[in-house]
């Protein structure tokens, strides 16, 4: 639903994009997820702050908890507990990394109309939850959990050894959170609330980097984060249980790890409770190709977890790394032994495979040159999941449904020819019992969001259908996108090009690559975004593609662990390949070209302005890795193995920007990079400038004093002026 | 003047339910929580429960628990409290009360008005 | 769940003379947040309901004589009659909503000397 193209007569009266635009995101769309609190209801902020309970079978709707209480405590977030008495108020919120944030709670009382006045919770609180049934709560403060078996009782202390940087208790130290559990959490209460399992990490001997944060005190302050690089102790994990009940009768007590995993460095990757008295735990060795799923029992003679051998389910990869970009996580049946899984099937595409007593026995449920990207719920009979088959586009995501109560099982694309020109890109949200159903679309067109039948899959309302961004971009004049492919040796390579609006072949057009490029990544999406890239093509008259090389996912292990092994080499090849595939198109002007990227992908744009191929004229890395010995040890070993002599050093040290600093020398680069990036470190840019410096090579360099990774807020908006600037400097465009 | 006013008296047999109801006027229903407190003959005022009419939760004192349900009907401005399983320490005057509901965080509002009362026998 | 006891259990003062009743609690009723203390006083006459006269230890409810007054904080509170009249014949009762159960002290009757 993009709007349509106009006859020349309207042209005069359309407008191109603006930075302006962009920076104000005056073009930002809305998305809507229910929050489901049974399987008929669900909770949403209304555009006043109320926040609103909706019965889908009755059609009522009342406020449950009124703005004016949560004004009265300036709360940003909330959480009803399941027995709908309380709900918690979360304001105060201050970031910390990714995920992790620190905050104030207030517990509301629905029944009394009024907040929780006794034994009020500390602040600040890194993390709390309700418990699945009635009102228990569980918190981490200070590196600590405690719980509460009600929200006016005093708290109970779970845990005492909790030390900042030390032992973080049901909370992930920075390298968990980032990227291994991608939570602020490492706590989980079983379904029905009896137990609570919790992860404790061990940073002790982990070294730390430390930055300086300037703030506006006379002397910076220093940052200490226990972050292990690659090839560096890391920290250690162990898992832990509570009955909740009668949290002092035994106490917590470990779960243990299988043997095959403890024999050397291991790491704990997911907990997923299967009933109140049966976990599943999936461990992976430190060298990341084998992972063991352990399935475990609570013994109530000894008031202990077992986890026999024949429970341990181990999946192994002898191409690459064990999973995608995480291993996957098993979604249990109605039977609590059997669950569903996805993995690569013998033909090296991730797909459903249903295991019953072993994996070598599994069933595989999916199979296709295309991958099965997600299960969202398994139902008595029915599996829901997402993937990219439909047509053959890796890029789309549609929702399936399998009937499991059936033989043979029947397949039905939910999705697939709902709104097919607006929506080929879709992820769900799934009510209790997927009695209901919501399916937010991404794109192509203007995002979508609607209620659906989980019996029929009949549509029953639009929740947000962004008709107030249609309506301001009528008179924009958007780029043309268009997805296509490249076969090159054996290769697909999937681009999306952004094109200007009145593009015409027979024309040259200066060309941008943006790219990411990290393993399991992917770029090529058929999603609807109006953003900096949409600026350069409408307004500048850019052409700008985007490439998905070896190394990105969703299109088989060959392409996906084609990388393995060898960072840097294979994701930089494919751009270039491309860059020469689009100048034979013929409507690049090779004498402008550029590429760009943000992380892992100014890692790729630097290497790529180093590769001597006299492709680029210039280019810009934001916060590039220059070199993994720099960068997390669970990220870069899963693909790069370790940093030894008897490992995979010589790559390491092959592999990085610095090395390649003589290559610069003909290229006009900008390296920009925050000072207070806990990710990749300003360590990274401050030894390419180094390097280049010594190499006597001129460049241009940006940082944004105490930001992050991710350079938000105002440095935002002078990060995107700066690049432009130095684009259109580079293309010759005026200003 | 507000107004909360309860159903009449109810003599009743050990083990079976009573249910007393307090309709209450010139006032905004849904800005004030229903209370309801006991007074068995010589004893101190007890509470038994409390119910906020917006969303029709109830919270009861541990004591009853199982055995008494408040409930309400907006649409009649009235609020009920059901008591099962009777017993003889059961007799008591019932009262319904009103209690403002605090939205904000610093508020927090007593009980200040009450229903005259309904006295429940419970007597073989 | 917070107790309240109330002394004496009865008092007989002269019509004029001040009457004065003392209610303590189990736990403090000082939230600290806003300073305030969630106790009130009800009077209760025979055969009529409880009717509110202070709230917030020491705030009077609208239409209650000045002769009443509450004062105290924390977990010692003082219901206090400067000048008994006869209409103010009744069982005293404090009452705590700082936190769940409500809990009401066991009454402190008042009668003419």
């Known amino acids: 639903l993009r709007p349509p193209r106009v006859h020349n007569s309207e042209e005069n009266t359309m407008r191109a994009l603006t930075l302006k635009d962009i920076l104000n995101g005056t073009f930002s769309y809305k998305t809507f997820f229910p929050n489901w609190i049974s399987g008929q209801e669900y909770l949403h902020q209304s555009a006043d702050n109320n926040i609103v309970l909706y019965n889908i079978e009755t059609g009522q709707s009342y406020t449950i908890l009124s703005n004016r209480t949560m004004k009265s405590v300036n709360a940003s977030n909330y959480g009803l507990s399941p027995d709908r008495q309380f709900v918690y108020l979360e304001s105060d919120y201050s970031k910390l990394w990714r995920y992790s944030y620190t905050a104030t709670y207030y517990i509301y009382d629905l029944s009394n109309g009024e907040f929780v006045r006794g034994n009020e919770l500390p602040r600040p609180i890194q993390y709390l939850c309700w418990s699945p049934v009635g009102s228990k709560l569980a918190y981490v403060y200070q590196n600590n959990i405690y719980l509460k078996q009600r929200p006016g009782d005093p708290p109970f202390q779970i845990t005492f050894n909790g030390r900042e940087n030390k032992i973080f208790n049901g909370i992930p130290d920075w390298v968990y959170e980032e990227e291994m559990l991608a939570t602020k959490y490492a706590l989980w209460w079983s379904p029905n609330g009896k137990f609570l399992a919790y992860a404790e990490f061990n940073d002790t001997d982990i070294p730390v980097i430390a930055y300086s944060y300037y703030g506006d005190e006379q002397y910076p302050r220093t940052i200490n984060i226990p972050y292990p690089k690659a090839g560096a102790k890391n920290p250690f994990v162990r898992i832990f249980i509570i009955d909740t009940t009668y949290p002092a009768y035994v106490g917590p007590q470990e779960v243990p790890v299988p043997a095959m995993i403890a024999s050397s460095d291991y790491y704990f990757s997911w907990l997923t409770w299967v009933t109140d008295e049966r976990v599943c735990l999936q461990w992976l060795k430190r060298v990341q190709n084998v992972s063991v799923l352990s399935i475990c029992d609570f013994r109530e003679d000894w008031q202990t977890w077992d986890c026999p051998k024949t429970q341990e389910h181990i999946e192994e990869s002898r191409t690459g790394w064990a999973g995608g970009f995480f291993v996957s996580t098993p979604v249990f049946s109605y039977d609590a032994i059997s669950y569903y899984k996805i993995f690569s099937d013998k033909d090296g595409y991730k797909h459903i495979h249903y295991i019953k007593d072993t994996v070598e026995n599994a069933i595989q449920i999916t199979s296709g040159k295309w991958e099965a990207i997600n299960i969202f719920r398994v139902t008595q009979d029915s599996l829901f999941y997402s993937s990219n088959e439909f047509e053959d586009y890796p890029g789309r995501r549609n929702i399936y449904r399998i009937s499991i109560g059936s033989y043979p099982p029947s397949k039905k694309c939910v999705t697939c020819h709902l709104r097919k020109e607006r929506c080929q890109y879709y992820t769900a949200s799934f009510s209790d019992y997927a009695k209901y159903y919501a399916l937010v679309c991404y794109g192509p067109g203007i995002p979508i969001s609607t209620l659906h039948d989980g019996r029929t899959d009949q549509e029953i309302k639009i929740l947000e259908e962004n008709k107030e961004l249609e309506n301001a971009l009528k008179n924009i004049q958007l780029p043309k996108e268009e997805i296509k492919k490249l076969e090159v040796d054996e290769i697909t390579l999937w681009y999306k090009m952004i094109l200007p609006p009145q593009f015409d072949r027979s024309k040259k057009y200066p060309l941008l690559i943006q790219v990411y490029g990290g393993p399991c990544s992917q770029s090529v999406r058929s999603v609807f975004a109006v953003n900096w890239i949409s600026y350069l093509a409408s307004k500048e008259g850019m052409v700008i593609a985007l490439v998905d090389g070896r190394g990105t996912a969703f299109q088989g292990d060959k392409l996906l662990y084609a990388v393995y092994r060898k960072l840097g080499v294979y994701e930089v090849e494919d751009q270039i390949t491309a860059v020469r595939k689009f100048i034979e198109m013929g409507f690049i002007d090779e004498k402008r070209i550029a590429i760009w990227g943000w992380s892992y992908g100014g890692y790729v744009s630097s290497l790529a302005l180093a590769s001597g191929t006299g492709l680029f004229k210039c280019g810009i890395a934001v916060a590039p890795v220059s070199s993994w010995e720099y960068y997390a040890s669970v990220y870069t070993e899963r693909f790069m193995g370790l940093p030894t002599k008897d490992d995979n050093l010589e790559h390491y040290k092959n592999s990085t920007v610095m090395a390649r600093a003589e290559y610069f020398r003909n290229v006009d680069y900008l390296l920009i990079h925050g000072t207070a990036d806990d990710n990749v470190h300003f360590q990274n840019s401050a030894q390419i400038a180094k390097a280049l410096v010594n190499a006597q090579v001129d460049f241009q360099a940006m940082w944004y004093s105490d930001q992050n990774h991710g350079l938000s807020g105002l440095s935002t908006n002078h990060l995107y002026t700066h690049m432009t600037h130095f684009l259109k400097q580079c293309f010759s465009l005026s200003d | 003047q507000v107004q909360l006013v309860q159903s009449g008296a109810e003599v009743k047999k050990p083990g079976a339910s009573v249910k007393v109801s307090c309709k209450t006027s010139r006032y905004t229903f849904t800005e004030y929580t229903i209370h309801w407190v006991r007074q068995a003959p010589g004893q101190r005022l007890e509470w038994i429960g409390g119910i906020n009419p917006n969303n029709g939760i109830p919270n009861y004192n541990q004591k009853f628990k199982g055995r008494v349900t408040i409930t309400v009907d907006t649409s009649a401005s009235t609020a009920y409290m059901e008591l099962s399983s009777l017993r003889s320490e059961d007799t008591a005057v019932y009262y319904c009360?009103?209690?403002?509901?605090?939205?904000?965080?610093?508020?927090?509002?007593?009980?200040?008005?009450w229903g005259q009362g309904t006295l429940v026998t419970v007597s073989s | 769940d917070i107790v309240m006891t109330q002394s004496p259990d009865s008092l007989a003062v002269s019509l004029g003379e001040r009457a004065t009743i003392n209610c303590k609690s189990s736990q403090s009723l000082l939230y600290s947040r806003n300073q305030k203390n969630y106790l009130a006083w009800y009077q209760q006459k025979p055969g009529q309901p409880p009717k509110l006269l202070i709230f917030?230890?020491?705030t009077r409810e609208s239409g209650v004589p000045d002769r009443f007054s509450g004062s105290g904080f924390g977990t010692d509170f003082t219901l206090t009659i400067s000048s008994l009249q006869a209409e103010d014949v009744a069982v005293y009762y404090c009452q705590q909503y700082f936190s769940y159960p409500l809990t009401f002290g066991q009454g402190t009757k008042v009668e003419i000397k």
């Open positions: 009360a009103r209690r403002r509901i605090a939205y904000g965080y610093d508020e927090g509002h007593a009980m200040d008005y």
């Open positions: 917030w230890a020491s």
